[in-house]
């Protein structure tokens, strides 16, 4: 039998892009009954949390104050039930933003285009950087990267109404240290009449999966957790 528990889920609360000097919050969602959670950063032990009482909560929050470039990078977490440790979570990339300067974002041929037109975004930052990033609001996980000395281009190809929305860009000093965000550029794509009226606009709220869904246990949850554990053992 494998002497490990299932890996936990690691998430950033609200966003994985944290302005410098602000607090980041990472959640590690493991299992009811876990007596200890550890946060590891780039292979080092960063923090330990012991929930009280352990059987009533399925995870913990780790608060990282005063965000800076030394705290930006890859995080993972692990938990313990009794003397049994879980597998390590997937890696979460935590990025520090608002470093140094603010880039300028522009779009060609313009912010209002017709479906099928080719569109290119340009991100410009005069201070030394080689990597640029383009993000669409509400889709912050879908980062597009491009390279250039002071300017990078992001060709979008023929656009559809799905490309509608607000875009920002960042200059990147390394994978985990980004500039201030540019001012947003709103791309408006008009299409066929029937398409236009039906096409939803992108949400401007943060990504829905960037929330910590830690729950306190009820009797029903306990039964479900037990059933799930039994089912997993049967599957093994």
């Amino acid at each position: 039998p494998k002497q490990t528990l299932p890996k936990p889920i690691i998430r950033a609360e609200s966003t994985y892009m944290v302005p410098k000097e602000k607090q980041a919050t990472l959640c590690c969602q493991g299992s009811y009954g876990a007596v200890e959670y550890q946060l590891h950063f780039e292979g080092s032990l960063f923090a330990v949390e012991r929930p009280k009482p352990p059987e009533r909560i399925n995870g913990v929050k780790f608060h990282i104050p005063d965000m800076n470039s030394r705290k930006a990078g890859r995080y993972s977490c692990i938990y313990r039930v009794g003397e049994l440790w879980s597998e390590r979570s997937d890696l979460l990339d935590l990025v520090v933003t608002e470093m140094y300067d603010t880039p300028t974002l522009s779009v060609h041929p313009g912010p209002e285009v017709t479906s099928g037109e080719k569109v290119t975004f340009y991100c410009r930052l005069d201070t030394a950087t080689s990597m640029f990033l383009l993000l669409k609001e509400g889709r912050s996980r879908d980062v597009q990267r491009s390279y250039g000395k002071v300017q990078a281009e992001f060709p979008m190809g023929p656009v559809t109404t799905a490309h509608r929305g607000s875009y920002r860009c960042f200059g990147s000093y390394n994978n985990y240290a980004w500039s201030f965000p540019s001012e947003p550029v709103k791309l408006l794509v008009t299409g066929d009449i029937e398409n236009t009226s039906l096409a939803p606009t992108d949400p401007t709220f943060p990504d829905s999966w960037d929330t910590c869904l830690l729950t306190r246990e009820t009797g029903l949850q306990k039964d479900l957790a037990l059933w799930d554990h039994t089912a997993q053992n049967l599957l093994r």
Epitope: K2, Q3, K7, E36, Q38, G43, S44, L45, W85, E87
Partner: antibody, heavy 116, light 106 residues
Framework: QVQLQQSGDDLVKPGASVKLSCKAS????????INWIKQRPGQGLEWIGR????????YYNEIFKGKAILTVDSYSNTAYIQLRSVSSEDSAVYFC?????????WGQGITLTVSS | QIVLSQSPAILSASPGEKVTMACRAS?????IHWYQQRPGSSPKPWIY???SLASGVPARFSGSGSGTSYSLTISRVEAEDAATYYC?????????FGGGTKLEMK
């Protein structure tokens, strides 16, 4: 049960390269980092570096860069350390250790003797 | 790099005695971990994250400290505790070990 089985003791000539192995069993190899540690006779412990079995990414103690190369073979669940151009300074016991919530499982160690 | 200094280098104790060994870091670390090593064996994890006992470690052992000053205490020493104890930090790269405290029985 979890085990880290290291290859046998080795005797090599100065200037040669040597590759030592650490075979893992009893757990999901890709879910845990592996560290390598050096201990010279009658001395303390020195961290060489670590390898991430899932990706093969490596992190080294600066003083071992150019001396040690860490690799993994995820098919055989084995971590390796290659030592280049060895000298008497490299004569030591080399341990591998798994990182869970702590460095919880260690190999039995490999005694490397460098002698002409 | 963070240098860990252990004291004393050698500690002599009689069974039943309470003993404490120290580990001082050259700069602040989040946690200290302790290993027990007997001659010819690999190090065994003993105390992790400053104060948590590793699996199978007797409750007479305890760890404490913060910042740059840490310690390992044995409330009532037993003959089987004779070994070398190393402190370690893996909060900061490169990870480092102390020079060890050798616990001997009188």
């Amino acid at each position: 049960q979890v085990q880290l089985q290291q290859s046998g003791d080795d005797l090599v000539k100065p200037g040669a390269s040597v590759k030592l192995s650490c075979k893992a069993s009893g757990y999901t190899f890709t879910s845990y980092w592996i560290n390598w540690i050096k201990q010279r006779p009658g001395q303390g412990l020195e961290w060489i570096g670590r390898v991430v079995p899932g990706s093969g990414r490596t992190y080294y103690n600066e003083i071992f860069k150019g001396k040690a190369i860490l690799t993994v073979d995820s098919y055989s669940n084995t971590a390796y350390i290659q030592l280049r151009s060895v000298s008497s300074e490299d004569s030591a016991v080399y341990f591998c250790a798994r990182v869970g919530g702590y460095w919880d499982y260690w190999g039995q160690g490999i005694t490397l003797t460098v002698s002409s | 790099q963070i240098v860990l200094s252990q004291s004393p280098a050698i500690l002599s104790a009689s069974p039943g005695e309470k003993v404490t060994m120290a580990c001082r870091a050259s700069s602040s670390v989040n946690y200290i971990h302790w290993y027990q090593q007997r001659p010819g064996s690999s190090p065994k994890p003993w105390i992790y994250a400053t104060s948590s006992l590793a699996s199978g470690v007797p409750a007479r052992f305890s760890g404490s400290g913060s910042g740059t000053s840490y310690s390992l205490t044995i409330s009532r020493v037993e003959a089987e505790d004779a070994a070398t104890y190393y402190c370690q930090q893996w909060s900061s790269n490169p990870y480092t070990f102390g020079g060890g405290t050798k616990l001997e029985m009188k």
